[in-house]
Interface confidence: medium
Amino acid sequence: LNTTVLQGMAGQSLRVSCTYDALKHWGRRKAWCRQLGEEGPCQRVVSTHGVWLLAFLKKRNGSTVIADDTLAGTVTITLKNLQAGDAGLYQCQSLRGREAEVLQKVLVEVLEDPLDDQDAGDLWVPEESSSFEGAQVEHSTSRNQETSFPPTS
């Protein structure tokens, strides 16, 4: 799986939408976890409702919220009030028993909001988003951002 890079501003929200094959993942809960290093374990941050039919209800852990539209095949994770320490490697996962299938790998990078500090570090946004290993880059310059990833087969 390629890693998708998302960049958000400190203090703002970042919304991630991982799409999946609704039929294949029927009945499965979804989870959002933080990976500790490239080969390290993935530490669960939040998962969808324990009752699959109620997966559309928002589940929160701290400033992270998850909800799953099981018919559309889209799980949405919102990272609210981004902090520098929220940066890292994450995964959208589909859970089946004790096993977890990775739907999408996401690298979250947190930038200082130049509006908060006029002397903040440079924010360089290329005219065309650069791409490494097929990953997409998104620049969060608004108060909210939603990014959808293509379904994984």
Partner: antibody, heavy 118, light 107 residues
């Protein structure tokens, strides 16, 4: 295994510039940012800033703003930190550290001693 | 800028004793706090992240606690290799800041 190898020690005169390199290996360079931290002799750690190895976005410590530039060369998996208008209080060991966050730095460079002296 | 104040500056203890190091933030950093160990001539080594999680390969005698503004690093029973300088670091807000350090020395 993951390695960050920094360039060698430098002696500079006040007012000069220094450019420290940090060559990464053993991981996907563009999947991690690079932080720079310095430590004056006998002193504590000071965060200098961070650069995204993915697209070059940077965050610099305000006190160094205008004097520091961090860059990356993805073709060689190398990060650079340039500090200009050197002063004697810039004498320090300069470290690069890998991390998508600022403290999941499971890999650090060995450090580069920069001495500023007339 | 968030200021981190570590205390005590120096802790003199014997091997086998318990070490308790404090880090206080000038404003809340939630749980965005890490602890590092540094020995002379070496780069810092991550011990604890997110206030209480041990980094990979760190012995169980190291533990972190706290949230908000008050944090503690505890070494349950000091080993000879634990005598070093310890730094806390916050990543809640830019700029990232470190505490001034606590030196744990042999009594």
């Amino acid at each position: 295994q993951v390695q960050l190898v920094q360039s060698g020690a430098e002696v500079k005169k006040p007012g000069a510039s220094v450019k420290v390199s940090c060559k990464a290996s053993g991981y996907t360079f563009t999947s991690y940012g690079i932080s720079w931290v310095r430590q004056a002799p006998g002193q504590g750690l000071e965060w200098m800033g961070w650069i995204s190895a993915y697209n070059g976005n940077t965050n610099y410590a305000q006190k160094l703003q205008g004097r520091v530039t961090m860059t990356t060369d993805t073709s060689t998996s190398t990060a650079y930190m340039e500090l200009r208008s050197l002063r004697s209080d810039d004498t320090a060991v300069y470290y690069c550290a890998r991390g998508p966050s600022h403290y999941y730095d499971l890999a650090w460079g060995q450090g580069t001693l920069v001495t500023v002296s007339s | 800028e968030i200021v981190l104040t570590q205390s005590p500056a120096t802790l003199s203890l014997s091997p086998g004793e318990r070490a308790t190091l404090s880090c206080r933030a000038s404003q809340s950093v939630s749980s965005y706090l890490a602890w590092y160990q540094q020995k002379p001539g070496q780069a810092p080594r991550l011990l604890i992240y997110d206030a209480s999680n041990r980094a990979t390969g760190i012995p169980a005698r190291f533990s972190g606690s706290g949230s908000g503004t008050d944090f503690t690093l505890t070494i349950s029973s000091l080993e000879p290799e634990d005598f070093a300088v310890y730094y806390c670091q916050q990543v809640s807000n830019y700029p990232i800041t470190f505490g001034g350090g606590t030196k744990v020395e042999i009594k």
